[in-house]
């Protein structure tokens, strides 16, 4: 399990990054809304 070996000065990692630029779009928060009279109402 070399990935999580503890060396001094390092910690086990927990965060997940958007590493590949092509994933930027798929990791933006989804916006769900209803179009009413030309205005988007969040729902």
């Amino acid at each position: 399990d070399a990935e999580f070996r503890h060396d001094s000065g390092y910690e086990v990692h927990h965060q997940k990054l958007v590493f590949f630029a092509e994933d930027v779009g798929s990791n933006k928060g989804a916006i769900i809304g209803l179009m009413v009279g030309g205005v988007v109402i969040a729902c």
């Epitope: 990935e3 997940k16 990054l17 590949f20 630029a21 092509e22 994933d23």
Partner: antibody, heavy 112, light 112 residues
């Protein structure tokens, strides 16, 4: 905690096949592109296959094109690499990687 | 494909002294979101690569603050302010702005 665990490596004869698997956990697998990267003994890092988050776009370098196939099962949080027509020069440690995280690697040895 | 060129390829260092590695890309790494997806990894002997710096200058979690990254466009630098014994290994720059993901040749850092 993010983890990537490869399996399926081993010794295979030239011309043979192997299927590598990578079990992902600790993150929303279906949102991220994934890759297989290999490292021949004493050499640098070489991308062998890349797949986008939904699995409908793949990339292979000329060295493996037509022989290797990357795929993913987002329901099972698993990445695969099907390797056919293996050659001696495919001998390497194969890593499953999301970029920021890498598995421990699985050794593939192609030899008669 | 984007070609990543590192220099030097070998770097003998003195404990407690600074060290610097350069990385140049064959084309701009600026993505449409304004970020450059240029990253630095360290691979210690017998281990998987580990992410140190992402998107030019951001330290990954758990990475000591003696590591820093800088640069823009096509020219990037990794600096270690004071080298420690645990910093030996092979450092790779890589880009993930463009498909395919590509790597530099690696810079081997060793203690004099």
């Amino acid at each position: 905690e993010v983890q990537l665990v490869e399996s399926g490596g081993g010794l295979v004869q030239p011309g043979g096949s192997l299927r590598l698997s990578c079990a992902a956990s600790g993150f929303t697998f279906s949102r991220y592109s994934m890759s297989w990267v290999r490292q021949a003994p004493g050499k640098g890092l070489e991308l062998v296959a890349q797949i986008n988050s939904v699995g409908n776009s793949t990339y292979y370098p000329d060295t493996v094109k037509g022989r290797f196939t990357i795929s993913r099962d987002n329901a099972k949080n698993t990445l695969y690499l099907q390797m056919n027509s293996l050659r001696a020069e495919d001998t390497a440690v194969y890593y499953c990687a999301s970029g920021d995280y890498w598995g421990q690697g699985t050794l593939v040895t192609v030899s008669s | 494909d984007v070609v990543m060129t590192q220099s030097p390829l070998s770097l003998p260092v003195t404990l407690g002294q600074p060290a610097s590695i350069s990385c140049r890309s064959s084309q701009s790494l600026i993505y449409s979101d304004g970020n450059a997806y240029l990253h630095w990894f360290l691979q210690k002997p017998g281990q998987s690569p580990r992410l140190l710096i992402y998107k030019v200058s951001n330290r990954f979690s758990g990475v000591p603050d003696r590591f820093s990254g800088s640069g823009s466009g096509t020219d990037f630098t990794l600096k270690i302010s004071r080298v420690e014994a645990e910093d030996v290994g092979v450092y790779y720059c890589s880009q993930s702005t463009h498909v395919p993901w590509t790597f530099g040749q690696g810079t081997k850092v060793e203690i004099k």
